[in-house]
Interface confidence: medium
């Protein structure tokens, strides 16, 4: 999906007002220095691409974040403010047929959400030069 035509300011507002708090809640009890940020993004569409991938695609060691509150809110914000996003998601979901594992907050999931926090912070500061 091409995130170029999303309403970035509305998505930023959604992040600042609610998604950021849910990410912090998920990471509660974890030191902010515990994980190194290894995923980066260069502009807002690229950041949303990476955010979508890390939030909704199952990875080794972290089967599914899809029903976490920050993920549900992320999906809602993208669905509302990115034209045509839902149709793309329907096709992707049917192609993946992913299975949800027992809900366990693994260290791998914590690392993944830490990466998400970095991507969202980067999304909110699009004019900063890439580190």
């Amino acid at each position: 999906y091409d995130f170029t035509n999303c309403d970035f300011e509305k998505i930023k507002a959604a992040y600042l007002s609610t998604i950021s708090k849910d990410l912090i809640t998920y990471m509660s009890g974890t030191k902010s220095t515990e994980f190194n940020n290894t995923v980066s993004c260069s502009n807002r569409p690229h950041c949303l691409t990476e955010i979508q991938s890390l939030t909704f695609n199952p990875t080794a060691g972290c089967a599914s974040l899809a029903k976490e509150m920050f993920a549900m809110k992320t999906k809602a914000a993208l669905a509302i403010w990115c034209p045509g996003y839902s149709e793309t998601q329907i096709n992707a979901t049917q192609a993946m047929k992913k299975r949800r594992k027992r809900k366990v907050t693994t260290n791998k999931c914590l690392e993944q959400v830490s990466q998400l926090q970095g991507l969202w912070r980067r999304f909110n500061r699009p004019l900063l030069k890439q580190q």
Partner: antibody, heavy 123, light 106 residues
Framework: QVQLVESGGGVVQPGRSLRLSCAAS????????MHWVRQAPGKGLEWVAV????????YYGDSVKGRFTISRDNSKNTLYLQMNSLRGEDTAVYYC????????????????WGQGTTVTVSS | SYELTQPASVSVSPGQIASITCSGD??????ICWYQQKPGQSPVRVIY???KRPSGIPERFSGSNSGNTATLTISGTQAMDEADYYC?????????FGGGTKLTVL
């Protein structure tokens, strides 16, 4: 109290158009996503469309895509459904329903429903 | 398109437990709502986010959702619970309803 009142239903010939209205009161209309849901005689609920906030996306059920248009006028606290190229299978009671207030309750369903307005498509 | 499947009818004796199922591919990945509709009336939401009960809905209504099946459970079913029940989920940004289950209290 929170209330939704639909109007605009009636008998219409196939191929013609009709516009339904839903007047909202008792809550901040502009802050909520709004849905249309229909129910054919003796059948189950069928989702028709949703319109979120000002400037946001609209989504439609497959059976009405390209024929129906959902819109809203926040200054009038009113939701609309413009129905074009009507068919016999569009005959139903049409309900207006309130959806999400924010991103957190996006998936919480529809908590307030109107009483419905009946649309009959017949020659 | 995504489909939710419900039994057409369920019968239960007063005071017994009624279980109404709703099945769909990987349904546990989605949040489910349940609606009650009595004849001639508009639907009423009785469960949201799988298992949460709106204010004003009796405690005898509960919900669960895992794997491919969501279940609405009514413990101590009363005559007033006789109605049609619909499950509902989001498939991305489109709403999907189950076909509905007629609950008969014998």
């Amino acid at each position: 109290q929170v209330q939704l009142v639909e109007s605009g239903g009636g008998v219409v010939q196939p191929g013609r158009s009709l516009r339904l209205s839903c007047a909202a009161s008792g809550f901040t209309f502009s802050s909520y996503g709004m849905h249309w849901v229909r129910q054919a005689p003796g059948k189950g609920l069928e989702w028709v469309a949703v319109k979120w906030y000002e400037g946001s996306n609209k989504y439609y059920g497959d059976s009405v895509k390209g024929r129906f248009t959902i819109s809203r006028d926040n200054s009038k606290n009113t939701l609309y459904l413009q129905m074009n190229s009507l068919r016999g299978e569009d005959t139903a009671v049409y309900y207006c329903a309130r959806g999400a207030h924010d991103y957190g309750d996006f998936y919480y369903g529809m908590d307030v429903w109107g009483q419905g307005t009946t649309v009959t498509v017949s020659s | 398109s995504y489909e939710l499947t419900q039994p057409a009818s369920v019968s239960v004796s007063p005071g017994q437990i009624a279980s109404i199922t709703c099945s769909g591919d990987n349904l546990g990945d989605k949040y489910i709502c349940w609606y009650q509709q009595k004849p001639g009336q508009s639907p009423v939401r009785v469960i949201y986010q799988d298992n949460k009960r709106p204010s004003g809905i009796p405690e005898r209504f509960s919900g669960s959702n895992s794997g491919n099946t969501a279940t609405l459970t009514i413990s101590g079913t009363q005559a007033m619970d006789e109605a049609d029940y619909y499950c509902q989920a989001w498939d991305s940004s489109t709403v999907v309803f189950g076909g509905g289950t007629k609950l008969t209290v014998l």
